[in-house]
């Protein structure tokens, strides 16, 4: 028989982690493996049909994506949809596929809303999702004794798909669910310095444990301004939510692992400011299969898609599409073996959920709602040389914080700052006021 996979991803724009130039080679590798393995869909042919999720400008579109999905549905009657990755593109497509009872498989669509499976029935996320970041942060807070207050700042950049809004939304909601904690959130425009100044005035009254989602340059600017304002690492800790580790990469921008460095005359101050900074990224898979997969992926991307893939955490997305597709095909194979059909979306999806799978990204666990358990890394500066390195990983499956290579977190005072200042944010602690009174008497 024939099994049709309908792809709805950006076909022209290569900048998205889920661009077809990146995911296409991963799909090819997965399908080559299906052909090579007699236990997967014996006697079946798998073919892909493509639709674009981007508009004429090459930007993800909540109009183009559902139109492409509808066209693919009526023209090819696919057994499964692969993608979209962008939040606004995935939302309408996911609602349509739920109505059609056709599985949707993606390694994108990380926003909180896609976890609501009565609306997004049969949507399986084989990639990371933002609510899972909240699980990590909640575990971190418990361990460090921060169970009262946190502040989240997120940058707005025109045309960036509101990436930071969705990231902080998932983090915010999950942390509040997991801990009985007060969480404030503030938005700022990256290109408006007056916003930064306003943030710095607000910060001391709102939090000491601060999460920031922004570009690496905006984060560095904020850290420099915080240093100037005296918001230093003895009392504050700033977590950069840099999930793909952009700030830690070399190339055109900062030197590898030195996110404070620009060679612009402010590096000395920036290094000092970054003593108060930690960086949260997705965890880079360290299993040998992943490294081998990357080699093949890059080769295929160049040969068949005329695309040069850079190194970095973005490659975990095509790798997750690869693993997700293999998991789907495994589920179809099992469904057929039990007398089902390839159009039995519910049955196939149920076989994917609440299941573990050994893929190129390592041990992959899809939870009972069809979302992948996600691993994260926490990076911190080595005070000796100013380089950032992974100090601990979070294992999403076991929900454990895993200490790495004898390293420890760097706290300027030797211990983590409390999440609420000793006298409260507005010196409201009566004991502190008593002290002031006694000095006046």
């Amino acid at each position: 028989g024939n099994l049709t996979v309908a792809v709805v991803l950006p076909l022209a724009n290569t900048s998205y982690p889920w661009s077809w130039a990146r995911v296409g080679p991963a799909v090819e590798l997965a399908l080559a493996q299906v052909k090579a393995r007699p236990d997967l869909l014996p006697g079946w042919t798998v073919r892909t049909v493509l639709g674009s999720s981007e508009n004429a400008l090459g930007v993800c579109s909540d109009t183009a994506a559902p139109l492409a999905a509808v066209d693919l549905k009526w023209e090819h009657n696919p057994a499964v949809f692969l993608g979209p990755g962008c939040v606004y593109a995935a939302a309408p497509v996911g609602r349509f596929t739920a109505h059609w009872r056709v599985p949707l498989l993606t390694a994108g669509a990380p926003a909180l809303g896609f976890g609501v499976k009565d609306e997004y029935a049969l949507t399986t996320r084989a990639g990371p999702s933002y609510a899972k970041l909240g699980d990590f942060v909640a575990a971190l807070h418990r361990r460090l004794g921060w169970e009262r207050q946190a502040l989240m700042l997120y940058a707005y950049r025109p045309g960036d798909e509101e990436h930071c809004f969705f990231l902080v939304e998932g983090l915010f909601m999950r942390v509040r669910d997991r801990l009985n904690i007060t969480v404030d959130h503030l938005e700022f425009a990256e290109d408006d310095l007056s916003h930064y100044t306003r943030l710095l005035r607000t910060m001391p009254r709102k939090g000491r444990v601060i999460y920031i989602c922004s570009s690496p340059d905006a984060f560095r600017t904020l850290m420099l301004l915080a240093l100037e304002a005296g918001l230093c690492g003895e009392d504050y800790v700033f977590f950069h939510l840099d999930i793909f580790g952009q700030s830690l990469q070399g190339g055109q921008g900062p030197a590898p692992r030195r996110p404070w460095e620009r060679g612009d005359g402010q590096d000395v101050s920036a290094r000092q400011a970054f003593q108060a900074a930690k960086i949260i990224t997705y965890k880079d898979p360290d299993n040998p299969e992943y490294l081998e997969f990357l080699k093949q992926l890059k080769h295929l991307a160049y040969e068949q898609f005329n695309f040069t893939m850079e190194d970095g955490l973005v490659n975990t997305i095509p790798a997750s599409f690869h693993d997700g597709l293999l998991l789907y095909i495994q589920a179809v194979t099992e469904t057929l073996a039990h007398g089902g059909t390839v159009t039995d979306g519910e049955n196939i999806t149920q076989r994917m959920w609440n299941r573990s799978f050994q893929g190129v990204t390592g041990y992959l666990k899809i939870d009972s709602s069809g979302d992948r358990e996600t691993d994260f890394s926490l990076w911190d500066m080595d005070p000796e040389n100013g380089a950032f390195r992974v100090v601990l990983n979070y294992n999403g499956t076991s929900q454990e914080l895993v200490a790495v290579s004898g390293r420890k977190l760097n706290w300027p005072l030797g211990y983590p700052p409390p999440d609420i200042p000793k006298c409260g944010f507005d010196n409201e602690d009566p004991a502190c006021n008593q002290d002031h009174l006694s000095t006046l008497e």
């Epitope: 460090l144 454990e400 290579s405 004898g406 420890k408 005072l413 030797g414 211990y415």
Partner: antibody, heavy 120, light 107 residues
Framework: QVQLVQSGAEVKKPGASVKVSCKAS????????IHWVRQAPGQGLEWMGI????????SYAQNFQGRVTMTRDTSTNTVYMDLSSLRSEDTAMFYC?????????????WGQGTLVTVSS | AIQMTQSPSSLSASVGDRVTITCRAS??????LGWFQQKPGKAPKLLIH???SLQSGVPSRFSGSGSGTDFTLTISSLQPEDFATYYC?????????FGQGTKLEIK
């Protein structure tokens, strides 16, 4: 509650090896490091080395380099310290202790100690 | 390796006395220093971490201070159960190193 339980006392001949175990319970094994400390009779504390249970990373004090090997078994939450080429000066109490790399609290819980006697 | 020099090596004092023990590092270790108490036949017990943070369950008569290279452990009013040997430990980098210990005896 957090516990580190060490193996029993050992008597060894010079030149032999000893393997002391330290079984952890009451906390997430891979979230903390385990250190080993030696204390000869009537002497002070001497840091021997550290092992990271998650990845097996080790760092040893110069004094013990080449003679000590620290390993772990994550299936049983146990860390082992192997000291080879024993000499009489190695007669000592050996302690394992836990270290939190997040809050950076050093050696907050200790094992009860294992006495190793080296004698011909 | 960082050397830790503890002084005095022994000290006689009476119940109720205020006692101070010092520890000097051969290079700056920021606040990365702990103080331990050890009684005969027992494992050491952590009193102070990060130079001045009292470990939970430790009486408030114990306090620590200092940063960089010079550190102090103070017992404000000695109790009978405080007679023991005290050690400092630098946990700034590997290899960790202990001071040679201060034996606190009853006068």
């Amino acid at each position: 509650q957090v516990q580190l339980v060490q193996s029993g006392a050992e008597v060894k001949k010079p030149g032999a090896s000893v393997k002391v175990s330290c079984k952890a319970s009451g906390y997430t094994f891979t979230s903390y490091y385990i250190h080993w400390v030696r204390q000869a009779p009537g002497q002070g504390l001497e840091w021997m080395g550290i092992i990271s249970p998650s990845d097996g990373y080790t760092s040893y004090a110069q004094n013990f380099q080449g003679r000590v090997t620290m390993t772990r078994d994550t299936s049983t939450n146990t860390v082992y310290m192997d000291l080879s080429s024993l000499r009489s000066e190695d007669t000592a109490m050996f302690y394992c202790a836990r270290n939190d790399p997040l809050t950076t609290v050093a050696l907050d819980y200790w094992g009860q100690g294992t006495l190793v006697t080296v004698s011909s | 390796a960082i050397q830790m020099t503890q002084s005095p090596s022994s000290l006689s004092a009476s119940v109720g006395d205020r006692v101070t023990i010092t520890c000097r590092a051969s290079q700056g270790i920021r606040y990365d220093l702990g103080w331990f108490q050890q009684k005969p036949g027992k494992a050491p017990k952590l009193l102070i971490h990060a130079a001045s943070s009292l470990q939970s369950g430790v009486p408030s008569r114990f306090s620590g201070s200092g940063s960089g290279t010079d550190f102090t452990l103070t017992i404000s009013s000695l109790q009978p159960e405080d007679f023991a040997t005290y050690y400092c430990l630098q946990d700034y980098n590997y290899p960790f190193t202990f001071g040679q210990g201060t034996k606190l005896e009853i006068k």
